[in-house]
Structure formats: structure tokens, C-alpha cells
């Protein structure tokens, strides 16, 4: 594949990255589908400025993002890793809270009306971001 | 009601140490990250340093990097500031304070005068 | 690292009128622009946060506006309490910054 110079028509780009930002809602393993269909990923926060990009884009809206821990460690859908990584929950959370009545804890994270993180049930349609990295190389074949 | 109180100012010799503290109450001081800001005295404010709630992210300034640490012990409530190096520059007063969603400071401790001369 | 300039330095105002502070970011910064009061002797209080909400507990003769690189905080009514010094600071991206201070004081 060729290596993307520029990113996709609707997608913004910010410091070698390209985001997408849907408007309507799906459950994290389809929003988390979704983006690997369009060889990108749920977007994955490694600092306080991609925090604030993408906070000032989604709004004050609940919107998933590819951090999740249904096998057990929250883990980043890239491989970032967590322990050392970019944190920014909410205040107590994450809580894997099971009072929702849903079945099951919470297990999907993302980002709330004030930009900080939570944990929710990974069925319920949110919005989403999907992220691809510039530099790496597209599953497109290259023009001739 | 939420407080931060600061202790460990003084006078210090220029290149020498001090630690200073920030004692926290009436909030869950577990998951906030903290700040330390600085204010020359007659001039503006500066920040520090920031720590994660869990100690995991720190940033510093440019002018503190390398001299200062930032490091908390939550199981004492309490947010620390390790200055190295100190310099005549350094002499100021020492705010703590709490941080509100990413890089806003809701609650200010009192000061603690930090004065660097020989 | 982002530089934040405020304007004027210093003013003098009456019981009553209206003061505009600005605050110019060197880069965008969104809407992550935070005022501050400050007391001699005391502790900077957030006043706004993200460019126009008013922190819990401030009159609402407080008000801000902008976005990108300019903003403004607005005094309606200035009340005796108002006087002292106000600054902003961008939280878009460490190291945060905060400009230089405007002091406002009784004509």
C-alpha cells in the first residue's frame, strides 16, 4: 500500500493524524467496526492536546472512543499502552458500575458532555470517533 | 468545604533544597490531578507542574524541568513539590491547586513563600 | 509554548460601569480560556472557565467571550468588591499559560 499524505474528504486533520466524527449513534463493537472498515480505529487519546481537539469537535456528547476493557485490563484498540498512558476519567470513575439493571458492568469508555472520561454499557449507541495516522500505509493500492 | 494548605516555605541558600507540601480535605483527593503555580513577588502568575490523580502523567514548565518534581501520596492526602538547584529566581509564593476538567484551577491553597537568597 | 497577552495592564473604572479585559492567545486555542481574580495578599478564584461559564458561587455581572486566539472578560455593573487583578490562562496544551495580569482600580 501507499503511505496517506492527506486525509479522506470529511475528515480533519490534527498534528499527522485524521479524525472522523459521526453524528448519529452505534454500540462500540459496530462504531469500533465501522472504523476499522475504513482502515482507521476508534480514536485512541495519547495527550492533552489531542484531549482538547477532540473534546472542542464532539461537543458537550457522549461519544465512544477504542479504549474498553471487556477482557479484563483496559486496554487501548492500537495497543497504546494504558498503565502509562493518557488518562482523563471523571472523578470515581471508572466504576464498572452493574446498577444500570443492563446485565453486566461497564465495559467501553468515553467521553462524556465535559470532555472527561467514563465507563458505560458497550451496547448503548453513542456517537464515535474514528482516527487514522498519516504516516502509515493505506490498504489502497497505489496510482499508477 | 475542599482546602489546601501549603507548608515547607522558608528562606534557602541559592543551589540548595526544599520540599514543600499541600495538605488536602473535604474532597475525594484520589481523583483529581493537582498543580503547582508560583507568583514572583509584584509579578504574575506562573504555572509548575500538574500530577495525574494516580501519578501516572506529570508536565513542567520549561523553567522547572529537571530541578523541580512533582509526586503525591494519596494515602496522606498530601501533594509534594521537590525543588533542586534553587535560584534567586525560584523566590516566590507557592500555590497548590486542584484541577477541574484538564488545565482549570477550581481551588487555590493559601501560599507558601519560598524565599531563595544568601 | 503558547503566549498570552492581556490588555491593558491596568485601569480605572467607577462603581457602576462597564470594564472589557482581552486576553490573545500566539496559536488556537479553541474555547480553553480561563479567568482568574485576584486579591492582593490572597489566592487566585476562578472566575469563568472555557471561555464564558461562570464558576459556581460568581455574580453574573461576570461574563467572557471569544474563541481561537481572542477573548474578552466583561464587568457589568462593577461593584467595590470587583476591584483587583484578573487573569486568563489558556488550558489548551502544557505548559498552561496565563497572561500578564490586568489590574482594575477605583478612578
Known amino acids: 500500500g501507499s503511505e496517506r499524505t492527506c486525509c479522506p474528504v470529511n475528515w480533519v486533520e490534527h498534528e499527522r493524524s485524521c479524525y472522523w466524527f459521526s453524528r448519529s449513534g452505534k454500540a462500540w463493537a459496530d462504531a469500533d467496526n465501522y472504523c476499522r472498515l475504513e482502515d482507521a480505529h476508534l480514536v485512541v487519546v495519547t495527550s492533552w492536546e489531542e484531549q482538547k481537539f477532540v473534546q472542542h469537535h464532539i461537543g458537550p456528547v457522549n461519544t465512544w472512543m477504542g479504549l474498553h476493557d471487556q477482557n479484563g485490563p483496559w486496554k487501548w484498540v492500537d495497543g497504546t499502552d494504558y498503565e502509562t498512558g493518557f488518562k482523563n476519567w471523571r472523578p470515581e470513575q471508572p466504576d464498572d458500575w452493574y446498577g444500570h439493571g443492563l446485565g453486566g458492568g461497564e465495559d467501553c469508555a468515553h467521553f462524556t458532555d465535559d470532555g472527561r472520561w467514563n465507563d458505560d454499557v458497550c451496547q448503548r449507541p453513542y456517537r464515535w470517533v474514528c482516527e487514522t495516522e498519516l504516516d502509515k500505509a493505506s490498504q489502497e493500492p497505489p496510482l499508477l | 468545604q475542599v482546602q489546601l494548605v501549603e507548608s515547607g516555605g522558608g528562606v534557602v541558600q541559592p543551589g540548595r533544597s526544599l520540599r514543600l507540601s499541600c495538605a488536602a480535605s473535604g474532597f475525594n483527593f484520589s481523583s483529581y490531578g493537582m498543580h503547582w503555580v508560583r507568583q514572583a513577588p509584584g509579578k504574575g502568575l506562573e504555572w509548575m507542574a500538574v500530577?495525574?490523580?494516580?501519578?501516572?502523567?506529570?508536565y513542567y514548565a520549561d523553567s522547572v524541568k529537571g530541578r523541580f518534581t512533582i509526586s503525591r501520596d494519596n494515602s496522606k492526602n498530601t501533594l509534594y513539590l521537590q525543588m533542586h538547584s534553587l535560584r534567586a529566581e525560584d523566590t516566590a509564593v507557592y500555590y497548590c491547586a486542584r484541577d477541574e476538567r484538564l488545565g482549570i484551577f477550581d481551588y487555590w491553597g493559601q501560599g507558601t513563600l519560598v524565599t531563595v537568597s544568601s | 509554548d503558547i503566549q498570552m497577552t492581556q490588555s491593558p495592564s491596568s485601569l480605572s473604572a467607577s462603581v457602576g460601569d462597564r470594564v472589557t479585559i482581552t486576553c490573545r492567545a500566539s496559536q488556537n486555542i479553541y474555547s480553553y480560556l480561563n479567568w482568574y481574580q485576584q486579591k492582593p495578599g490572597r489566592a487566585p478564584k476562578l472566575v469563568i472557565y472555557s471561555t464564558s461559564s461562570l464558576q459556581s458561587g460568581v455574580p453574573s455581572r461576570f461574563s467572557g467571550s471569544g474563541s481561537g486566539t481572542d477573548f474578552s472578560l466583561t464587568i457589568s455593573n462593577l461593584q467595590p468588591e470587583d476591584f483587583s487583578t484578573y487573569y486568563c490562562q489558556q488550558s489548551y496544551s502544557p505548559p498552561l499559560t496565563f497572561g500578564g495580569g490586568t489590574k482594575v482600580e477605583i478612578r
Open positions: 500530577i495525574w490523580y494516580d501519578g501516572s502523567n506529570k
